[in-house]
């Protein structure tokens, strides 16, 4: 058993049918010695008397808020949560496996640049009685500070007979050095509590591996005289690291017809312009990627050919 926060305790339960459970001793936080009784949640049933209460925690029905009283007065509370292990594996019931980039991916994180700021998000199908707490650091043995805000509900989606809730959190490395080579990964830890169930989730990554630039901005077309060709131009996104001479991007320019089946013409360039043939009813899209490290491509920025 360990303390999650004041008066809230997590019991680690290795569960299987007929498991003996965990013996937990609760102590009433009071100088009083006599006339103390214990109850669970809203029930008036007396579970025991004395300054300590010994309970056998076998299942969620044994968790909840234990209260010690004397003469009708509440002396202290202890909220017991369960962290369940089955077949040697800690439960992961609260968050949904996003399965990308691989199975057992519960937390996904992205950064728009090398400033040390990043966003993580996760999915759940639980709509109520749910709290998250996020901590982060660079490295784990001698951790350097990363400050995370509060997790917030950022999207709700209905997919068939599933209703999904997306939560996200923003974090900022306290002393980020954008140009430095990373040797220690960022660690992100999320505590999730649903009712009386505690779970924790972790992710470890280098900022360079989670980079996803914003789409190029100010995408414009300039027709070339007496030609079906156009000059496409764009700019680096505002959120990308500076100077651009050091934090350089590469770009992919795509001409896509109205039909998805039509052949796509693609051009790759390090410049912020390109000359392409603009077909009728086609659109031109441009996306960006770090020039020197193959992290994610940005989303597309698009304009119609017409």
């Amino acid at each position: 058993i360990w303390e999650l926060k004041k008066d809230v305790y997590v019991v680690e339960l290795d569960w299987y049918p007929d498991a003996p459970g965990e013996m937990v001793v609760l102590t009433c936080d009071t100088p009083e010695e006599d006339g103390i009784t214990w109850t669970l949640d809203q029930s008036s049933e007396v579970l025991g008397s004395g300054k300590t209460l010994t309970i056998q925690v076998k299942e969620f029905g044994d968790a909840g808020q234990y209260t010690c009283h004397k003469g009708g007065e509440v002396l202290s509370h202890s909220l017991l949560l369960l962290h369940k292990k089955e077949d040697g594996i800690w439960s992961t019931d609260i968050l949904k496996d996003q399965k990308e980039p691989k199975n057992k991916t519960f937390l996904r994180c992205e950064a728009k640049n090398y400033s040390g700021r990043f966003t993580c998000w996760w999915l759940t199908t639980i709509s109520t009685d749910l709290t998250f707490s996020v901590k982060s650091s660079r490295g784990s043995s001698d951790p350097q500070g990363v400050t995370c805000g509060a997790a917030t509900l950022s999207a709700e989606r209905v997919r068939g007979d599933n209703k999904e809730y997306e939560y996200s959190v923003e974090c900022q490395e306290d002393s980020a050095c954008p140009a430095a080579e990373e040797s220690l990964p960022i660690e992100v830890m999320v505590d999730a509590v649903h009712k009386l169930k505690y779970e924790n989730y972790t992710s470890s990554f280098f900022i360079r591996d989670i980079i996803k630039p914003d789409p190029p901005k100010n995408l414009q077309l300039k027709p070339l005289k007496n030609s079906r060709q156009v000059e496409v131009s764009w700019e680096y996104p505002d959120t990308w690291s500076t100077p651009h001479s050091y934090f350089s991007l590469t770009f992919c320019v795509q001409v896509q017809g109205k039909s998805k089946r039509e052949k796509k013409d693609r051009v790759f360039t390090d410049k912020t312009s390109a000359t392409v043939i603009c077909r009728k009813n086609a659109s031109i899209s441009v996306r960006a990627q770090d020039r020197y490290y193959s992290s994610s491509w940005s989303e597309w920025a698009s304009v119609p050919c017409s």
């Epitope: 049918p17 299942e59 969620f60 089955e86 019931d93 199908t125 007979d161 599933n162 009712k195 169930k197």
Partner: nanobody, 123 residues
Framework: EVQLVESGGGVVQAGESLRLSCAAS????????LGWFRQAPGMEREFVAA????????YYADSVKGRFTISRDNAKNTVYLQMSSLKPEDTAVYYC????????????????WGQGTQVTVSS
């Protein structure tokens, strides 16, 4: 919101078998653990059995262990309670319940409840 509808109750002789079904609908049914409870006249609601949302783990009250089997078919959105070697003391209204705190034998740990189906075991 999960909706639960029980069926399969009836009158049987002691020693016979019966299979109860609980059809579920609504959002996120497959993410819920499912349980069966029962309530005899004048008695409190009593836990019978539960199955985890993955269907890989089951939990039984001592009074039904070895006689009752809980199972689920996520493709059919249905949970079953196979009851054998029935006894007169198994007579009760049987309720299907859905929640997210598996394992729990406590009724208030379940969020959604069916209307119940009557099982009567005569001697």
């Amino acid at each position: 919101e999960v909706q639960l509808v029980e069926s399969g109750g009836g009158v049987v002789q002691a020693g016979e078998s019966l299979r109860l079904s609980c059809a579920a609908s609504g959002y996120n049914f497959k993410d819920h653990d499912l349980g069966w409870f029962r309530q005899a006249p004048g008695m409190e609601r009593e836990f019978v059995a539960a199955i985890s949302w993955r269907g890989s783990s089951t939990y039984y009250a001592d009074s039904v262990k070895g006689r009752f089997t809980i199972s689920r078919d996520n493709a059919k959105n249905t949970v079953y309670l196979q009851m054998s070697s029935l006894k007169p003391e198994d007579t009760a209204v049987y309720y299907c319940a859905a929640g997210r705190l598996y394992p729990s034998s406590r009724s208030r740990d379940y969020d959604y409840w069916g209307q119940g189906t009557q099982v009567t075991v005569s001697s």
